[in-house]
């Protein structure tokens, strides 16, 4: 009778995480009597996966009934596969012996590779806001995928970016991998509505890549432009001065009126108008009673935007017997402004 051989017909098996792996093994003879054991890895550090005779292996089931007389199929199924299960599995025939069963013949091994999907990419931007023309960095991370091959792309508003660096870790063999990429993006004033997208393509995703997004509205700060104008006379002794705060983002803004350097009023932007590009406009006005002044008045509109140092714009108000119109306001955004008389 020919000596028993242990046959593992599959050199490799590829299984998706969460699925069941079938590891095939047959013997060519029933002799000698003794159990089959499955191990992951070889040598003294090998890990016991299944012992036909002793132990409890809840994730493992046998394909056929190993107790049947003529059974020579020692294939097993391992349920709920994770990347940690990857490795080479050996079907090993033991013959009964004392004090322990004696290893008799091993199969050639089956390499189990686990296909694991990458986690949803997480995109994070800089901790602090930046202004247009500045370059900011965005990072994208995805974890737990296998095999190692993966493709990552960056987009801004649908346009592919080229200035980025990507690393896949670890460099050597591992049960699963992580990807980390950093992209550089130059901000423009129009980026309030812009999105940065990190797209990850992997064999497990069947052509449907995963995307992570970051809204540049979380990153950009567009500083306002200020314009102070004197409006037509409302009454014989009153002048209306407006401060137009244009194209700012985010909305957090505080405006202070100064009269000859002295604070006359402070207000917070509330009812703003939104421009198509996502920036905001706001207008504040001040009613100045010129009869209360003998000298010229310097009016200053001082704006503190998003916690940044204040910017200001001044207007010299000439005090004369007949105040003249010093400018015209073509903007209609005067909602939410406050009237204030200076006495």
């Amino acid at each position: 009778e020919e000596e028993l051989q242990v046959i593992q017909p599959d050199k490799s098996v590829l299984v998706a995480a969460g699925e069941t792996a079938t590891l095939r093994c047959t013997a060519t003879s029933l002799i000698p009597v003794g159990p089959i054991q499955w191990f992951r890895g070889a040598g003294p550090g090998r890990e016991l996966i299944y012992n036909q005779k002793e132990g409890h292996f809840p994730r493992v089931t046998t394909v056929s009934d190993l107790t049947k007389r003529n059974n020579m199929d020692f294939s097993i199924r391992i349920g709920n596969i994770t990347p940690a299960d990857a490795g080479t599995y050996y079907c090993v025939k033991f013959r009964k012996g004392s004090p322990d069963d004696v290893e008799f013949k091993s199969g050639a091994g089956t390499e189990l590779s686990v296909r694991a999907k990458p986690s949803a990419p997480v995109v994070s931007g800089p901790a602090a806001r930046a202004t247009p023309q500045h370059t900011v960095s965005f990072t994208c991370e995805s974890h737990g995928f296998s095999p190692r091959d993966i493709t990552l792309k960056w987009f801004k508003n649908g346009n592919e970016l080229s200035d980025f660096q990507t690393n896949v870790d670890p460099v050597g063999e591992s049960v699963s991998y992580s990807i980390h990429s950093t992209a550089k993006v130059v901000l423009t004033r129009e980026d309030v509505h812009s999105q940065v997208i990190c797209e990850v393509a992997h064999v497990t995703l069947q052509g449907d890549p995963l995307r992570g997004t970051a809204n540049l509205s979380e990153t950009i700060r567009v500083p306002p432009t200020l314009e102070v104008t004197q409006q037509p006379v409302r009454a014989e002794n009153q002048v209306n001065v407006t401060c137009q705060v244009r194209k700012f983002y985010p909305q957090r803004l505080q405006l202070t009126w100064l009269e000859n350097g002295n604070v006359s009023r402070t207000e917070t932007a509330s009812t703003v108008t939104e421009n198509k590009d996502g920036t905001y406009n706001w207008m504040s006005w001040l009613l100045v009673n010129v009869s209360a002044h003998r000298d010229d008045v310097k009016l200053t509109c001082q704006v503190e935007h998003d916690g940044q140092p204040a910017v200001s714009k001044s207007h010299d108000l000439k005090v004369s017997a007949h105040p003249k119109e010093q400018g015209s306001n073509t903007a209609a955004e005067n909602t939410g402004s406050n009237e204030r008389n200076i006495y």
């Epitope: 009778e1 029933l30 002799i31 000698p32 009597v33 003794g34 159990p35 036909q52 005779k53 002793e54 132990g55 107790t67 049947k68 007389r69 013959r95 009964k96 004392s98």
Partner: antibody, heavy 120, light 107 residues
């Protein structure tokens, strides 16, 4: 260490019944098959039958059908053999012995034996 | 039932000698034959199964051979402690059957 501990000697009258036990330790009781073997004084060995504790499946030597009944108790890892309608021909040493499978007839561990004497 | 015949009920040998015990099956049992040693007052002990596989690593002076219907158990160098009855048994099909035994006596 694998051990099969059998119950003590029995002296019974003809026509009576006897139930002997074999307590297994040192291995997973339900993963192996338990056989019973008879040896009359100064004679050879005779296989009586087996029980598979995993599924309580039994197989008997035709010669011992109706004479021997094999049972097992998983909770105590104990196999039992009951012999009925005893005669002097049943006087013998009875061994329990373990094998790997129900199709494996080579017995790697044996109990120390239970001596049965049938006498009036 | 398969009948296993051990032609020698007794065999006499000396310490250090090589001795062979034979067993014949009434039909082909392939290599499904086991050999047991039973010392006086003790339980049988498995030495060889599947005709040639030694159950315990030691002593390696015990060997088995044969297939089909003719089988041999050999002690390469008999020791005093080998005094015992040796049984062959077929484990090819039920009912498992034993030979009548060969008693090894030391001169």
């Amino acid at each position: 260490e694998v051990q099969l501990q059998q119950s003590g000697p029995e002296l019974v009258k003809p026509g009576a019944s006897v139930k002997m036990s074999c307590k297994a330790s040192g291995y997973t009781f339900t993963s192996y098959v338990m056989h019973w073997v008879k040896q009359k004084p100064g004679q050879g060995l005779e296989w009586i039958g087996y029980i598979n504790p995993y599924n309580d499946g039994t197989k008997y030597n035709e010669k011992f059908k109706g004479k021997a009944t094999l049972t097992s108790d998983k909770s105590s890892s104990t196999a039992y053999m009951e012999l009925s309608s005893l005669t002097s021909e049943d006087s013998a040493v009875y061994y329990c012995a373990r094998s790997y499978y129900d199709y494996d007839g080579s017995f790697d561990y044996w109990g120390q034996g239970t001596t049965l004497t049938v006498s009036s | 039932d398969i009948v296993m015949t051990q032609s020698h009920k007794f065999m006499s040998t000396s310490v250090g000698d090589r001795v062979s015990i034979t067993c014949k099956a009434s039909q082909d049992v392939t290599t499904a034959v086991a050999w047991y040693q039973q010392k006086s007052g003790q339980s049988p002990k498995l030495l060889i199964y599947s005709a040639s596989y030694r159950y315990t690593g030691d002593p390696d002076r015990f060997t088995g051979s044969g297939s089909g219907t003719d089988f041999t158990f050999t002690i390469s160098s008999v020791q005093a402690e080998d005094l015992a009855v040796y049984y062959c048994q077929q484990h090819y099909s039920t009912p498992w059957t034993f030979g009548g035994g060969t008693k090894l006596e030391i001169k």
